[in-house]
């Protein structure tokens, strides 16, 4: 009778993570008597996957009833496959022996490759906000995919970006891989509503790429523009001075009025108006009693935005241009939360 051969008909098997892998193996003869074992890898460090004779292998089931003497099908199924299961599997026939079973014949091996989906891309931006015209870096990371081939693209508001660098690790063979990409984005004043998108395409995703996003609202700081204006006279001795704070983001803003360099009032932006581009406008005003002043008054609107150094705008109020009422040094009526009298 011909000597037993161990046949592994599949040179390679490709399985998606989470699925069951079937590793086929048949023998050409019923003799010699002895168990079949399955190993991952070859040589002294090989890993036992299944032993027909003994042991507990909860993830492994046999395709046929291996207890039967006339069985020559030693195929197995391995459940809940993960990338860590990738490797070459060998079906090995042992001859019943003493004191130990003796390896008799091995199959040629079946390479198990595992297709694993990449994790959802995570996009992270700079730790600190930046202002328009500055270039900021965004990173995108995705892990746990196999095989190694993967495509990553960057978009800003639907427009593909070209200034980025991508690495897939490790460089050599591995059970699974990670991708890391850094893109450079130039900020504009209109970017409050903008999004940066990292898109990952992989064979396991069947044409439906994964996306990670970052809102530039978390990254951008648009500094305000200031304008101080003197409104028409409300009453004979009163002047309304306004400070228009325009086009700023984020909302966190503190305004201080200075009279000839001395703090007059400090307030925090509350009831702001939002522009279409996502930036904010705010206005503060003072009701100035000019009769309390003998000299010209320098009014300064000083704004501290989002913890940055203060910016200011001044307005010179010409006292001589207004007649003075004798003894009128009492407070003018305070008609609004943003109004203040200057004595």
């Amino acid at each position: 009778e011909e000597e037993l051969q161990v046949i592994q008909p599949d040179k390679s098997v490709l399985v998606a993570a989470g699925e069951t892998a079937t590793l086929r193996c048949t023998a050409t003869s019923l003799i010699p008597v002895g168990p079949i074992q399955w190993f991952r890898g070859a040589g002294p460090g090989r890993e036992l996957i299944y032993n027909q004779k003994e042991g507990h292998f909860p993830r492994v089931t046999t395709v046929s009833d291996l207890t039967k003497r006339n069985n020559m099908d030693f195929s197995i199924r391995i459940g809940n496959i993960t990338p860590a299961d990738a490797g070459t599997y060998y079906c090995v026939k042992f001859r019943k022996g003493s004191p130990d079973d003796v390896e008799f014949k091995s199959g040629a091996g079946t390479e198990l490759s595992v297709r694993a989906k990449p994790s959802a891309p995570v996009v992270s931006g700079p730790a600190a906000r930046a202002t328009p015209q500055h270039t900021v870096s965004f990173t995108c990371e995705s892990h746990g995919f196999s095989p190694r081939d993967i495509t990553l693209k960057w978009f800003k508001n639907g427009n593909e970006l070209s200034d980025f660098q991508t690495n897939v690790d490790p460089v050599g063979e591995s059970v699974s891989y990670s991708i890391h990409s850094t893109a450079k984005v130039v900020l504009t004043r209109e970017d409050v509503h903008s999004q940066v998108i990292c898109e990952v395409a992989h064979v396991t995703l069947q044409g439906d790429p994964l996306r990670g996003t970052a809102n530039l609202s978390e990254t951008i700081r648009v500094p305000p523009t200031l304008e101080v204006t003197q409104q028409p006279v409300r009453a004979e001795n009163q002047v309304n001075v306004t400070c228009q704070v325009r086009k700023f983001y984020p909302q966190r803003l503190q305004l201080t009025w200075l009279e000839n360099g001395n703090v007059s009032r400090t307030e925090t932006a509350s009831t702001v108006t939002e522009n279409k581009d996502g930036t904010y406008n705010w206005m503060s005003w003072l009701l100035v009693n000019v009769s309390a002043h003998r000299d010209d008054v320098k009014l300064t609107c000083q704004v501290e935005h989002d913890g940055q150094p203060a910016v200011s705008k001044s307005h010179d109020l010409k006292v001589s241009a207004h007649p003075k009422e004798q003894g009128s040094n009492t407070a003018a009526e305070n008609t609004g939360s943003n109004e203040r009298n200057i004595y």
């Epitope: 004779k53 207890t67 039967k68 003497r69 019943k96 004191p99």
Partner: antibody, heavy 118, light 107 residues
Framework: EVQLVESGGGLVQPGGSLRLSCAAS????????MHWVRQATGKGLEWVSV???????YYPGSVKGRFTISRENAKNSLYLQMNSLRAGDTAVYYC????????????WGQGTMVTVSS | DIQMTQSPSSLSASVGDRVTITCRAS??????LAWFQQKPGKAPKSQIY???SLQSGVPSKFSGSGSGTDFTLTISSLQPEDFATYYC?????????FGQGTKLEIK
């Protein structure tokens, strides 16, 4: 139904011969190693011989040279030719199938009695 | 030849008891050990093979354990039909050899 049925037992004089048969049914006979086991009255079990799938045979020292095991796959039959019988060979003879992957006996016949006596 | 020694030779127990029979081989038999049950006038019946594998159709109250040279057969809860003689057998090396048997009797 998987079944083994022995026949051919009986009374024989010391030095005489006897041929036992075992008829197999319900399985592919040619795919299994087949064994003979005996048991003297009130005693334990003793393995007597085996014939492998490929026809290879083994015997313990107590019967070697006197007993011959054979098989006829076409007839699903196992045989034990016993020569130079002794009183110590008196026993119930069972055929058994090496039915597990490891040749463990899984199916036994009902046995046939062999008595060697003058 | 490999000698197989069973103990005890006989054992009295009651219905519901848990009993253990041991078998020792004179040399390592690589777990190729079987247990058989035999009732008077009947052929032996396979219970366990490769030391711990339950033969098809045998109830799970029977279990086998051990390795190398020392093995045990345990019956977790004796029923009337379990009272019989039990034999161990090594089938690692020709000639295959049996233990002398353990007679399990009702108390």
């Amino acid at each position: 139904e998987v079944q083994l049925v022995e026949s051919g037992g009986g009374l024989v004089q010391p030095g005489g011969s006897l041929r036992l048969s075992c008829a197999a049914s319900g399985f592919t006979f040619s795919s299994y190693d087949m064994h003979w086991v005996r048991q003297a009255t009130g005693k334990g079990l003793e393995w007597v011989s085996v014939i492998g799938i490929s026809g290879d045979t083994y015997y313990p020292g107590s019967v070697k040279g006197r007993f011959t095991i054979s098989r006829e796959n076409a007839k699903n039959s196992l045989y034990l030719q016993m020569n130079s019988l002794r009183a110590g060979d008196t026993a119930v003879y069972y055929c058994a199938r090496g039915g597990n992957w490891d040749d463990a006996f899984d199916i036994w016949g009902q046995g046939t009695m062999v008595t060697v006596s003058s | 030849d490999i000698q197989m020694t069973q103990s005890p030779s006989s054992l009295s127990a009651s219905v519901g008891d848990r009993v253990t029979i041991t078998c020792r081989a004179s040399q390592d038999i690589n777990n190729y050990l079987a247990w058989f049950q035999q009732k008077p006038g009947k052929a032996p019946k396979s219970q366990i093979y490769t030391a711990s594998s339950l033969q098809s159709g045998v109830p799970s109250k029977f279990s086998g354990s051990g390795s190398g040279t020392d093995f045990t057969l345990t019956i977790s809860s004796l029923q009337p039909e379990d009272f019989a003689t039990y034999y161990c057998q090594q089938y690692n090396t020709y000639p295959y050899t049996f233990g002398q048997g353990t007679k399990l009797e009702i108390k």
